[in-house]
């Protein structure tokens, strides 16, 4: 190897980087010489330090390379016996800068090897929970909510292979919706939107809820706070807008603490919010009898 | 290899209804997101709506909700999308695609609505 | 929902020169340090193909003269040396939310 700039790229999946040593043409100057590793996307670098006896004023310098801008992640200082560096990507580079002679560069042997990227934990949705089969490439998450909470977004993420490997979509949410149509409702919960933050103003929200056939419904009011003002909950017993009511917030100061029944399969739950004032809103929970 | 087939073209009246299928083939049905997407003659995408066979999950887009019915059979590994009350604006290719970022296409199936 | 402009509509670009195309979102969908940005390329009787997926990953088996670049709300799609087959519709898409939306596609003719 010649003295002055020098540079080796290396690809295979591991490898070794050794400081040059063939410095037989004398020369005023010092080295400046660039090692290049790439190993295949989805996977990063992993450079493992097994010896190293620089001189004074000497540098080594490494950089994860790959992304939008280089990414440093060691230099001599950091470089003992042992150490351990991973770059986050599939490119890396080791830069060695010796000193002129007479005092002749120092010198190294260091060890990389390819490691598989994985994907980063998923966030685990508030009202909600997540599992993971694996967080490499193929893995996958699976999502789900609190009963009364409904997910927004996709249920089922997959790891990705790429450069940096990455779950196909953001994380979903848990949210309360204002309203819905909750079919062969056996049990569960409904909560009105923001619960249990405070609901927003100027809502109205209709649920129906309708039991299997041949069963009917059993309503409890798990909590029901409401601003005092024109803040109004009405149960209806049947499936629509104009069945008659069993509770009106309006009509009815004390919640009826052994809860509603309804006489067919269908309860409509109707919330209503005006533009001032707002409070926790409602948690009903609901389950099906035999008739 | 990954395998996306429709069904062929298909020529129907106003206000009946369709069901087109995408035959799967070559990777894990279950474990991977079928969509649907519309697009018009000569114009651009639109996303349906999408199914997880494994478990039945759907996901629609608030254009098409009562629109499409989206449905999915594991052991024949085959997708299906139901359209309803259909109208001359529902006439277009409707593609289905392979996972949440679409890395492959049927081959696309033309709906015609017409008296 | 997040909408997606493309430009140009169209382009014509000579025989081994570069084409370059404009997506833009209107609002950033980077998530996680991943942009939820992909590029399809769609030929006339033809289903889309992926080129692109997470602004700068080539989808496999798909030439190394098709590149993306971009994060936030500005991706950008390079072809080059544009060869003739390359003459396509091409569309951005993303995925970061629902409903994954589509650009209006950006029509690339071969002089």
């Known amino acids: 190897q010649t003295p002055g700039p020098c540079s080796w790229n290396f690809s295979g999946p591991e490898g070794s980087l050794d400081s040059p040593t063939d410095l037989s043409s004398p020369t005023d100057v010092g080295l400046d010489c660039f090692f290049y590793i790439s190993v295949y996307p989805g996977y990063g670098v992993e450079i493992k330090v097994q010896n190293i006896s620089l001189r004074e004023g000497e540098t080594v310098t490494v950089e994860g390379l790959g992304g939008p801008d280089p990414l440093p992640l060691a230099n001599q200082s950091f470089l003992l016996r042992g150490q351990v560096i991973r770059s986050p990507t599939h490119q890396a580079a080791l830069r060695f800068q010796s000193l002129p002679p007479p005092a002749g560069p120092g010198t190294f042997h260091f060890h990389y090897q390819a490691y598989l990227l994985s994907c980063h934990f998923p966030r685990r949705p508030a009202y909600g929970d997540v599992t993971v089969t694996s967080l490499h490439p193929g893995g996958s998450a699976r999502f789900h909510c609190a009963t009364g909470y409904q997910l927004k977004g996709a249920r089922h993420l997959t790891c990705l292979n790429a450069t940096q490997p990455f779950w196909d979509s953001k994380e979903p949410v848990c949210i309360a919706a204002c309203g819905g149509v909750i079919r062969n409702a056996t049990t569960g919960r409904i909560v009105s939107p923001g619960f249990p933050g405070n609901y927003s103003n100027n809502l109205t929200c209709h649920w129906l809820l309708e039991a299997p056939e041949g069963q009917r419904l059993h309503l409890h009011f798990e909590k029901v706070s409401l601003a005092e003002d024109d803040d109004r909950l009405i149960i209806r017993n049947g499936d629509n807008v104009e069945a008659p009511p069993v509770y009106d917030s309006y009509e009815v100061e004390y919640l009826p603490i052994e809860g509603l029944l309804s006489s067919g399969k269908h309860f409509f739950v109707e919330l209503s919010t005006d533009s001032s004032g707002a409070a926790a809103g409602m948690a009903l929970r609901y389950e099906a009898f035999q008739q | 290899q990954v395998q996306l087939q429709q069904s062929g073209p298909e020529l129907v009246k106003p206000g009946a209804s369709v069901k087109i299928s995408c035959k799967a083939s070559g990777y894990a049905f279950s474990s991977s997101w079928i969509n649907w997407v519309k697009q018009r003659p000569g114009q651009g995408l639109e996303w349906i709506g999408r199914?997880?066979?494994?478990?039945?999950?759907?996901n629609y887009s608030g254009n098409f909700e009562g629109k499409a019915t989206l449905t999915a059979d594991k052991s024949s590994t085959t997708a299906y999308m139901q359209l309803s009350s259909l109208t001359s604006v529902d006439s277009a290719v409707y593609f289905c695609?392979?996972?949440?970022?679409?890395?492959?296409w049927g081959q696309g199936t033309a709906l015609t609505v017409s008296s | 929902d997040i909408v997606l402009t493309q430009s140009p509509a169209s382009l014509a670009v000579s025989l081994g020169q570069r084409a370059t195309i404009f997506c833009r979102a209107s609002?950033?969908?980077?998530?996680?340090?991943?942009?939820?940005m992909h590029w399809f390329q769609q030929k006339p009787g033809q289903p889309p193909k992926l080129l692109i997926y997470a602004a700068s990953n080539v989808q496999s088996g798909i030439p190394a003269r098709f590149s993306g670049s971009g994060s936030g709300t500005d991706f950008t799609l390079n072809i080059h040396p544009v060869e003739e087959e390359d003459a396509a519709t091409f569309y951005c898409?993303?995925?970061?939310?629902?409903?994954?939306?589509f650009g209006g596609g950006t029509k690339l003719e071969i002089k």
């Open positions: 898409q993303q995925s970061i939310e629902d409903p994954p939306t």
């Open positions: 695609t392979r996972g949440l970022v679409m890395d492959y």
């Open positions: 199914i997880y066979p494994g478990e039945g999950d759907t």
């Open positions: 609002q950033s969908v980077d998530y996680n340090g991943i942009s939820y």
